[in-house]
C-alpha cells in the first residue's frame, strides 16, 4: 500500500512540477524592472525568455518577441535549452510513469516491468527538475551580474548635464515558479525511485523446468535475481512438493506483500 501511495504521490508531485516548469518557461516575468525606492512607476519593463514587455501606468501593455536568434545572448539561449530539455524529459517521464502506475492495469504487465518504468520515469523527473533549477539559476546569476554592473553605472552623465537613468532588472516571478517547480519535479522523481524499490517483486523467476530427484520429492530451482532493478539479489531455494516437472508458468502465483491494488 505504501509503495502505491509513494508512486502515486511521486507522480502527482512531478505532474505539478512539470506544469510549473512549463508555466515558468512561458511566463514573461523572468526579470522585472527594479523599482528600488519608487514602488509606483509610469513605465514598467519586464522580460521573459521569448519576449520583453512594457506596461504603462495607463494600463497599456506592449510585448515584443525576440525575433532574432543569433543576436540573443548565449546565456539566454542556454537557459531556453535547459528549460526545453526539462519540459521534454518531464513530459516523457509523465508518459512512462502513467503506464508504470500500480493502480493502472495494462494487460498482463509484470511488476518487474512496472518497477523498471517507475525507475526510468523517476530518473527522468530528477534530470528534468535539475535542468529547470539549473536554467533558472543561470538566469538569476546573469541578472545579479547585470544588476551590479548597472548599479555601478546607474547614471551615465554627458558633460554632467544630461542624465540617462539605466533600467535595472531584478528577479521576476517566473524565477521563483521555476525554482519551486524544479524542486517539486526533483522530489517527485526521488519518490518514484523509492517506489521502484518496493515495486520490484521479491524474486524474478526465470522460466525454469523443475525436475524432481529420483530419491526425494524435492525439486531444486535456481533463485532468480533482480537484474532489471539492480536492487540486490535473491537466492532463496524454493521447494515444490508435487511430483513431475512443471514450467514456472504453471506454478500458482500468490499475492506478494506489494500486490495491493
Amino acid at each position: 500500500m505504501a509503495v502505491t501511495a509513494c508512486q502515486g504521490l511521486g507522480f502527482v508531485v512531478s505532474l505539478i512540477g512539470i506544469a510549473g516548469i512549463i508555466a515558468a518557461t512561458c511566463m514573461d516575468q523572468w526579470s522585472t524592472q527594479d523599482l528600488y525606492n519608487n514602488p509606483v512607476t509610469a513605465v514598467f519593463n519586464y522580460q521573459g525568455l521569448w519576449r520583453s514587455c512594457v506596461r504603462e501606468s495607463s494600463g497599456f501593455t506592449e510585448c515584443r518577441g525576440y525575433f532574432t536568434l543569433l543576436g540573443l545572448p548565449a546565456m539566454l539561449q542556454a537557459v531556453r535549452a535547459l528549460m526545453i530539455v526539462g519540459i521534454v524529459l518531464g513530459a516523457i517521464g509523465l508518459l512512462v510513469s502513467i503506464f508504470a502506475l500500480k493502480c493502472i492495469r495494462i494487460g498482463s504487465m509484470e511488476d518487474s516491468a512496472k518497477a523498471n518504468m517507475t525507475l526510468t520515469s523517476g530518473i527522468m523527473f530528477i534530470v528534468s527538475g535539475l535542468c529547470a533549477i539549473a536554467g533558472v539559476s543561470v538566469f538569476a546569476n546573469m541578472l545579479v551580474t547585470n544588476f551590479w554592473m548597472s548599479t555601478a553605472n546607474m547614471y551615465t552623465g554627458m558633460g554632467g548635464m544630461v542624465q540617462t537613468v539605466q533600467t535595472r532588472y531584478t528577479f521576476g516571478a517566473a524565477l521563483f515558479v521555476g525554482w519551486v517547480a524544479g524542486g517539486l519535479t526533483l522530489i517527485g522523481g526521488v519518490m518514484m525511485c523509492i517506489a521502484c524499490r518496493g515495486l520490484a517483486p521479491e524474486e524474478t523467476n526465470y522460466k525454469a523446468v523443475s525436475y524432481h530427484a529420483s530419491g526425494h520429492s524435492v525439486a531444486y530451482k535456481p533463485g532468480g535475481f533482480k537484474a532489471s532493478t539492480g536492487f540486490g539479489s535473491n537466492t532463496k531455494n524454493k521447494k515444490i512438493y508435487d511430483g513431475g516437472a512443471r514450467t514456472e508458468d504453471e506454478v500458482q502465483s500468490y499475492p506478494s506483500k506489494h500486490d495491493y491494488v
Partner: antibody, heavy 118, light 113 residues
C-alpha cells in the same frame, strides 16, 4: 462622448480646505486612472496626483503629500480632490484628466478656479 | 524630478510658415524596453484645458491635423507645425510621461507674425 465635468469656482481663505469634484461620463469610469493637474497664473502645469477608480490606489506628488487627498464615488462616477491648509500660492485652475496610452492625458475637465484670498 | 525646458518662450510665425518648438529634458525619456520616448505635446488655448496633440514623442493623437508632427529621442524633442494656421495660436507644452511625478515644460506661446 467622453466628458469630465468639474464643480464650480471656489473662493477660500488661507488655512481652509477645498474639495473639487470631477464627474466622468461616456466611458467605463473604473478602467482609467484619474489624474489631477493644476495651473497657477502664468505658471507651468503641475501634476498633483492620481487615483485608480477600480482599486482606489493613489499616488501623489511629494510636493503635495499630506495636503492633497484624492477620493472617489464609484456609484456616481465621480472623483474628488481635496486640498487642505490653503495658501495664496494655491490660487490656480485645477483640472482632472484621464490617462491613456503613452501616459498622456486625452480628456480633461473644463477646470475649476480656486482663489485663496484673505 | 525631470526638468523640461522649452525654447523659445514665445514664437511669432507667419501664416502658412513652419513653426518649430524645442523641448529639452534633464533625463532621457527613452524607454529601453520598447524603444519609445515618453514625451507628450499639448496645445492650450486661452480659457480652455490642454488638448493632447502627440504622445510617444511622435505619435499623433486621432483627430489632430497632420501638419502637427513630433520628433526627437532621448533628451531632445521637437514639435513642428508644417504650415501655420490661424487656429494654431496657443501655448504649447511638453510633458514627461516617463517617470513620476509627471512634469511639464514652461510652455511656448505661438503667435502669428
Amino acid at each position: 462622448e467622453v466628458q469630465l465635468v468639474q464643480s464650480g469656482a471656489e473662493v477660500k481663505k488661507p488655512g481652509a480646505s477645498v474639495k473639487v469634484s470631477c464627474k466622468a461620463s461616456g466611458y467605463t469610469f473604473t478602467s482609467y486612472w484619474m489624474h489631477w493637474v493644476r495651473q497657477a497664473p502664468g505658471q507651468r502645469l503641475e501634476w498633483m496626483g492620481m487615483i485608480h477608480p477600480n482599486s482606489g490606489s493613489t499616488n501623489y506628488n511629494e510636493k503635495f503629500k499630506g495636503r492633497v487627498t484624492l477620493t472617489l464615488d464609484k456609484s456616481a462616477s465621480t472623483a474628488y480632490m481635496e486640498l487642505s491648509s490653503l495658501r495664496s500660492e494655491d490660487t490656480a485652475v485645477y483640472y482632472c484628466a484621464r490617462l491613456k496610452t503613452g501616459n498622456s492625458f486625452d480628456y480633461w475637465g473644463q477646470g475649476t478656479t480656486v482663489t485663496v484670498s484673505s | 524630478d525631470i526638468v523640461l525646458t522649452q525654447s523659445p518662450d514665445s514664437l511669432a510665425v507667419s501664416l502658412g510658415e513652419r513653426a518649430t518648438i524645442s523641448c529639452k529634458s534633464s533625463q532621457s525619456l527613452l524607454n529601453s524596453g520598447n524603444q519609445k520616448n515618453y514625451l507628450t505635446w499639448y496645445q492650450q488655448k486661452p480659457g480652455q484645458p490642454p488638448k493632447l496633440l502627440i504622445y510617444w514623442a511622435s505619435t499623433r493623437e486621432s483627430g489632430v491635423p497632420d501638419r502637427f508632427s513630433g520628433s526627437g529621442s532621448g533628451t531632445d524633442f521637437t514639435l513642428t507645425i508644417s504650415s501655420l494656421q490661424a487656429e494654431d495660436v496657443a501655448v504649447y507644452y511638453c510633458q514627461n510621461a516617463y517617470t513620476y511625478p509627471f512634469t511639464f515644460g514652461q510652455g511656448t506661446k505661438l503667435e502669428i507674425k
